[in-house]
Interface confidence: low
């Protein structure tokens, strides 16, 4: 339905508060280095303009597309070339190329200072002094650091952020009330950002078909009682929402997401019995709740898949008639029967089925050729099952920190060219799979673990894409979205790697390590571990363990010393010498 003024349409649909918040998010995700005040000024100008269009949709420029309006506004920033360099060249282009150009310059790892949390009293004062500015600043800081954060979901996080301050700044013990809530929001926010980054990578690098296949599998697991036609409709709508958000069309995305939540709640009977509570919530909570809702129970009387997909004499006729729909039905039927499988495994099975039909439907006796196709699934199912079993056993034996260290060593040996901060970040996140998923019963382990690993490995892929250093990473990241994890799992030690020159400075530590949080201290030690492996890629587990144990003892000893700095300088030299001897450096 065409509107005379798109900006007026979205302003009216979303309301002023959400409109302003979403425009701020959009601008901060595009111009990640711009100061907060500059963004607020631009947002206010856009909002005032939108109001004139609401009053009169025929007013000058009101008929322009949102990309044109927003792009023109971004291109008024005076310091564009000094701050962003070649991104300023985008402004010489016309839409839609200009928006594509801005999208290509989004930076997954912007050079921004770490967000330091002020004292609770300082935060509460700032919150009370100017609540609106305080919350806008939250949106701005998250959006610029996470340029693909799912915008309507960020509105939900901001709502919870506000609720936390409203409640806790009045509490007797403000810190005890507020800090756990902020920690939870931070951790959930990072997870949400990473999940959305995978959706955008799926759409942008592998296309709409890949995203739709993922969505069919996931929604069929979640809504196994829903009809295929219903699932297809939801997939089409969900694809539109994510395509818009990943493309920077945040107003359209938020509006369409609200429409989708409304549709789902109006048609609960046809979709899932688990939606009732979600659908009683306000909009932002409702959409979040639907996205996280548990799988519905599987219908009791589902017949065997073989009849329609293997035994039927019409398989090739039906496949030829509408390939993607037939494969979609296969994926739907398989996924609704297997909530115990990861989405990526289901997609591998569907790909195997597709490959078999492509081959067999051209054969002399197609049925004879594809009759055993389900037998080909067995090794594909067993591979992640075995891997998860082994790694959960290792996790239970070592605990999270040491499990992370085992993964750090494993991945540094596979791809030693990758930067140390990236290896530490990715391996720490890979290691979190243990505490996240190993506690689950068998039936929930694989979807939890392998789909989580897909999200983490995508972080590696997007960070590596910015500065590619390893052909092996590029190969695993680009060849197949669903086979990324098996591709990385299959990598052995990189025999072509020339060990890094030893640099004593890398292993020089100071007294400031003693005041760090436990997490920060772990990161320091894990950074040293990666560097050790880069220097000595053939070091054994035992050798590395001995050096790391010595290192932990050294830190503990010097942090207890009266003259910490002297201890770190003197004992540090001894430790480096002993480590070099132990590892033969």
């Amino acid at each position: 339905d065409a509107h005379k003024s798109e900006v007026a349409h979205r302003f009216k649909d979303l309301g002023e508060e959400n409109f302003k918040a979403l425009v701020l998010i959009a601008f901060a995700q595009y111009l990640q280095q711009c100061p907060f005040e500059d963004h607020v000024k631009l947002v206010n100008e856009v909002t005032e303009f939108a109001k004139t269009c609401v009053a009169d949709e025929s007013a000058e420029n009101c008929d322009k597309s949102l990309h044109t309006l927003f792009g023109d506004k971004l291109c008024t920033v005076a310091t564009l070339r000094e701050t962003y360099g070649e991104m300023a060249d985008c402004c010489a282009k016309q839409e839609p190329e200009r928006n594509e150009c801005f999208l290509q310059h989004k930076d997954d790892n912007p050079n921004l200072p770490r967000l330091v949390r002020p004292e609770v009293d300082v935060m509460c004062t700032a919150f009370h002094d100017n609540e609106e500015t305080f919350l806008k600043k939250y949106l701005y800081e998250i959006a610029r650091r996470h340029p693909y954060f799912y915008a309507p979901e960020l509105l939900f996080f901001a709502k919870r952020y506000k609720a936390a301050f409203t409640e806790c700044c009045q509490a007797a013990d403000k810190a005890a009330c507020l800090l756990p809530k902020l920690d939870e929001l931070r951790d959930e926010g990072k997870a949400s950002s990473a999940k959305q980054r995978l959706k955008c990578a799926s759409l942008q690098k592998f296309g709409e078909r890949a995203f739709k296949a993922w969505a069919v599998a996931r929604l069929s697991q979640r809504f196994p009682k829903a009809e295929f036609a219903e699932v297809s409709k939801l997939v089409t709508d969900l694809t539109k929402v994510h395509t818009e958000c990943c493309h920077g069309d945040l107003l359209e995305c938020a509006d369409d997401r609200a429409d989708l939540a409304k549709y789902i709640c109006e048609n609960q009977d046809s979709i899932s019995s688990k939606l009732k509570e979600c659908c009683e919530k306000p909009l932002l909570e409702k959409s979040h709740c639907i996205a996280e809702v548990e799988n519905d129970e599987m219908p009791a009387d589902l017949p065997s898949l073989a009849a329609d997909f293997v035994e039927s004499k019409d398989v090739c006729k039906n496949y030829a008639e509408a390939k993607d729909v037939f494969l979609g039905m296969f994926l739907y039927e398989y996924a609704r029967r297997h909530p115990d499988y990861s989405v990526v495994l289901l997609l591998r099975l569907a790909k195997t089925y597709e490959t078999t039909l492509e081959k067999c439907c051209a054969a002399a006796d197609p049925h004879e050729c594809y009759a055993k196709v389900f037998d080909e699934f067995k090794p594909l199912v067993e591979e992640p099952q075995n891997l998860i079993k082994q790694n959960c056993e290792l996790f239970e034996q070592l605990g999270e920190y040491k499990f992370q260290n085992a993964l750090l060593v494993r991945y540094t040996k596979k791809v030693p060219q990758v930067s140390t901060p990236t290896l530490v970040e990715v391996s720490r996140n890979l290691g979190k799979v243990g505490s996240k998923c190993c506690k689950h019963p068998e039936a929930k382990r694989m979807p939890c673990a392998e789909d989580y690993l897909s999200v983490v490995l995508n972080q590696l892929c997007v960070l590596h894409e910015k500065t590619p250093v390893s052909d092996r990473v590029t190969k695993c990241c680009t060849e197949s979205l669903v086979n990324r994890r098996p591709c990385f799992s299959a990598l052995e030690v990189d025999e072509t790697y020339v060990p890094k020159e030893f640099n004593a400075e890398t292993f020089t530590f100071h007294a400031d390590i003693c005041t760090l949080s436990e997490k920060e201290r772990q990161i320091k030690k894990q950074t040293a571990l990666v560097e050790l492996v880069k220097h000595k890629p053939k070091a054994t587990k035992e050798q590395l363990k001995a050096v790391m144990d010595d290192f932990a003892a050294f830190v503990e000893k010097c942090c207890k010393a009266d003259d910490k700095e002297t201890c770190f300088a003197e004992e540090g030299k001894k430790l480096v010498a002993a480590s070099q001897a132990a590892l033969g450096l």
């Epitope: 009682k225 009809e227 295929f228 219903e230 219908p299 039927s312 019409d314 037939f326 039905m329």
Partner: nanobody, 115 residues
Framework: EVQLVESGGGLVQPGGSLRLSCAAS????????MSWVRQAPGKGPEWVSA????????RYAESVKGRFTISRDNAKKTLYLQMNNLKPEDTAMYYC????????GSQGTQVTVSS
């Protein structure tokens, strides 16, 4: 995109007949069993009848046995429900669905049985 479009509903007196049709598109109709489901005002969906992909095997809910007949024409990609000896309690919105399911994926056609 998968589409199911029902037609043939209407207002009929008790004891009368109607023939519902469901035109399918966007998927390989001949590969899948199909069902009719109905939903009376204020009630949950109720499965009515099902037919296998080839049309040989048909099933009916106890409440419609002997009065309703399900059939299909795979060449025309159409599913049918012949309803005879209609009763007031058959008043409902009727939907066709893929597979044997009580969920609706389409707009439906209204059947009202009243004197």
């Amino acid at each position: 995109e998968v589409q199911l479009v029902e037609s043939g509903g209407g207002l009929v007196q008790p004891g009368g007949s109607l023939r519902l049709s469901c035109a399918a598109s966007g998927f390989t109709f001949g590969s899948f069993g199909m069902s009719w489901v109905r939903q009376a005002p204020g009630k949950g969906p109720e499965w009515v009848s099902a037919i296998d992909s080839g049309g040989a095997d048909t099933r009916y809910a106890e409440s419609v046995k002997g009065r309703f007949t399900i059939s299909r024409d795979n060449a025309k990609k159409t599913l049918y429900l012949q309803m005879n000896n209609l009763k007031p309690e058959d008043t409902a919105m009727y939907y066709c669905t893929i597979g044997r399911s009580t969920s609706r994926g389409s707009q439906g056609t209204q059947v009202t049985v009243s004197s």
